[in-house]
Interface confidence: low
């Protein structure tokens, strides 16, 4: 009952807890001398139904028995699962203004009997842990249901624990609080779960297990690694384990990897040698344990040990390239460039590079160390020079990589033929060529070199290059390739002591230029006009300019203009035209053309030639 119920009582038949689908009779009775004060016969008892504190029905029409002014019985059917509240109220019909007065109330719970618990599973975490079992309770009963977990074993061992499920909490797991020790390894234990509520009870089938079936070792702890003689590839992994562990599983991987290396170790006793580690690599190590070779369960993985293997001396060959520039009659500037080793070759933090330039015949040697990936020196133009570079970390240096310094474009016979550059997509350019026609020495390799054709690019930016074997005639260049930028691409053919090259321009994507060239001057010399211009600013070119066009027409003429098309050369900024009439005023302008189309016209200039016409 939910109220003090001073005015009367409410009872339920057959009970306040009923199975789903059953009906119930609710009787509301007034206590003696309670009711409407003046006319007891005007007492009217009404029954209200509430679900989740919300009034859902007045059961006036469900009255099955009535003692006027004293008690009423109502039949309720089709109750839904869960709890429903019924409140009986007294309505004094002669007093229309007063609301009905609560008499008493009752809660009816509708549910189902528990199903037999199934899928019992028991574990003991660690040798010192306690046995905990979980199970599947089956369908929700909607009633408070008590569960009893009972365990029995050898030597009259019995133990039980209880918990309950209701609408606030679910009971499908219990820790028995007892510890099974390894000396019971061969013994059999039986557990059973019994469920009981107001509508019935049920029991699981007995579940039988042994110590080894249920004990899950604690994960190994205190994991550490010792690198033998500070080796970067060999280390001894050590850990602490529970005393009964006979089998371990190790897994380890570089931190950026997606697949583990797995190792099984029998009777490792907390120690295992690893021999295939990568130097100077961040690794993650984890270990799992098992108490029996064939039976039992693996522990959870241990917490990770994360550590970096020590360095070892670099291996691999540096990729070297160079630029030669005469700066005087007897001096040249050599700029050496090289690519960083990849991590598996560097095997540590590269502290510096050892660079050597040597004149072969006179044995002149220039040596230096640098932290950069380039080095520039001025040397005599005479003699045969060779360069070598090696990379050093804290453990040592890589073997030097040698390259002969030759005149890269000095031998026309070694120049590759039919060089072409085609845009493949936004990010790369396909370069193809044919081998030199009459090379008097064998081509050892091709170098494809490229740089953006922008002011200062030679001095500001190192070149990009690819080494190509002598039997290949194509290269897909993608490093630092951006759309709408024109690149100068050189294909070098190198023999032992000579070099030849061919050059082409290319872009990965192009648009028509934003503007045309700006005519700066028109001058007349020997009956020819010289048109001078400034090049289109680099960002406005939007790819490789193929040619310029000079347009002219007589002022105020409506005729189509004439035009002269000039092959684009970066070094050229003037061009003669000779077909203009003297003493006629002309309007001139220029445009630029890429593979995508023609730019808008540049500025217009007027000019009136004075000399004779050709």
């Amino acid at each position: 009952n939910i109220d003090v119920c001073k005015l009367g009582t409410v009872t339920v038949q057959p009970a306040p807890v009923i199975p789903l689908g059953s009906a119930a009779n609710i009787s509301c009775s007034l206590n003696p001398k309670q009711g409407c004060s003046h006319y007891p016969s005007s007492n009217e008892l009404i029954l209200l139904k509430f679900v989740n504190d919300v009034l859902v029905e007045n059961l006036h029409g469900k009255k099955v028995h009535d003692h006027t002014g004293h008690s009423s019985t109502f039949q309720v059917t089709n109750l839904s699962l869960g709890m429903t509240l019924f409140v009986c109220k007294l309505n004094c019909s002669n007093s229309q203004k007063k609301p009905p007065v609560p008499v008493c109330g009752v809660e009816i719970s509708v549910g189902v009997a528990p199903e037999p618990p199934q899928n019992i599973s028991c574990v003991q975490e660690g040798e010192n842990g306690t046995v905990a079992c979980s199970w599947n309770s089956g369908k929700v009963t909607y009633l408070k249901t008590n569960y009893t977990l009972q365990l029995s074993g050898p030597n009259n061992l019995t133990c039980q624990k209880q918990c309950f499920s209701d609408n606030r909490q679910n009971c499908n797991r219990l820790d028995l609080g007892i510890n099974l020790s390894p000396d019971l390894a061969e013994s059999r234990f039986i557990v059973r779960v019994t469920a009981i509520n107001d509508l019935g009870n049920s029991s699981s089938l007995p579940h039988t297990f042994t110590f080894l079936d249920i004990v899950i070792p604690l994960p190994p702890w205190d994991i550490r690694i010792n690198f033998l003689n500070a080796s970067g590839s060999r280390g001894t992994l050590q850990w602490e384990d529970e005393g009964q562990v006979v089998l371990n599983q190790l897994r380890y991987q570089p931190l950026n990897s997606t697949s583990w290396n797995m190792v099984n170790a029998t009777n490792a006793k907390g120690k295992y040698d690893l021999r295939d580690l990568r130097p100077f690599t961040e690794y993650e190590f984890q270990i799992s344990s098992k108490l029996h070779l064939s039976g039992g369960s693996w522990s959870n993985w241990s917490e990770s040990l994360r550590t970096r293997t020590p360095e070892e001396e670099p291996v691999g060959i540096l990729d070297i390239w160079y630029m030669k520039q005469d700066i005087d009659y007897d001096r040249q500037q050599i700029s050496l460039f090289w690519k960083s080793l990849n991590p598996s070759e560097a095997r540590g933090k590269i502290l510096h590079y050892q660079v050597t330039l040597q004149e072969v015949t006179k044995k002149t040697t220039l040596q230096n160390t640098t932290r950069h990936t380039s080095w520039t020196r001025v040397i005599p133009r005479t003699g045969a020079w060779t360069a070598s570079v090696s990379a050093a970390n804290s453990k040592g240096a890589s073997a030097p990589t040698h390259i002969n310094i030759v005149d890269l474009c000095g031998t026309g016979l070694l120049a590759p033929h039919q060089v072409s550059a085609k845009s493949e997509n936004m990010d790369n350019i396909l370069v193809t060529w044919q081998p030199p026609k009459k090379a008097d020495s064998a081509v050892r390799e091709y170098i494809v070199e490229w740089r953006a054709l922008q002011p200062g690019s030679i001095t500001k930016f190192p070149p990009h290059w690819l080494r190509i074997p002598p039997d290949n005639m194509s290269a897909l260049i993608s490093e630092n390739i951006k759309p709408y930028i024109c690149y100068e691409i050189r294909v070098h053919a190198l023999s032992e002591s000579q070099g030849g090259c061919s050059s082409i321009r290319g872009d990965s994507k192009h648009k028509a230029p934003v503007s045309g060239p700006h005519i700066t001057a028109i001058t007349e010399k020997k009956e020819r006009l010289f048109i001078s211009w400034t090049h289109i600013p680099f960002p406005e070119q939007r790819g490789c300019i193929l040619h310029y066009r000079i347009y002219w027409k007589e002022r105020d003429s409506t005729a189509q203009p004439e035009l002269c098309e000039i092959q684009y050369r970066r070094s050229q900024n003037s061009h003669p035209i000779s077909s203009l009439q003297p003493r006629v005023t002309y309007v001139l302008w220029m445009t630029a053309v890429t593979a995508a189309g023609e730019s808008p016209q540049g500025n217009e200039r007027e000019f009136c030639p004075q000399g004779k016409a050709n």
Epitope: E125, N128, G129, A132, R173, D175, L218, W221, E303
Partner: nanobody, 119 residues
């Protein structure tokens, strides 16, 4: 049977700090998962923070995240709850609890220690 003894509660001004300690006896401490719970007047007991047997896994209620830190020292057989930037709504009785496995129910409870945060 495990007994749990809390200490470190008291009265503190808002914004202040307290450090609660919990020492179990009766069982190897390093095999127990530990937790701190609290119950304010008229409210249900709620979890504050929990820590695994090894200390490798922790959990914090969203209301205390970044203000409270749970830790344990298996050598000293003690679990701690460091409470910083305390607020009046942190006022409650704080209970230490323990369980035999990382995944079980909390079987063992302390008597509680009062923490009062005044504004």
């Amino acid at each position: 049977q495990v007994q749990l003894q809390e200490s470190g509660g008291g009265l503190v001004q808002a914004g202040g700090s307290l450090r609660l300690s919990c020492t179990p006896s009766g069982r190897t401490f390093s095999t127990l998962a530990m937790g701190w719970f609290r119950q304010a007047p008229g409210k249900e007991r709620e979890v504050v923070a929990t820590i695994s047997w090894s200390g490798g896994r922790t959990y914090y209620a969203s209301s205390v995240k970044s203000r409270f830190t749970i830790s344990r020292d298996n050598a000293k057989n003690t679990a701690y709850l460091q409470m910083n930037s305390l607020r009046p709504d942190d006022t409650a009785v704080y209970y230490c609890a323990a369980r035999g496995t990382d995944y079980g129910a909390y079987d063992y409870w302390g008597q509680g220690t009062q923490v009062t945060v005044s504004s």
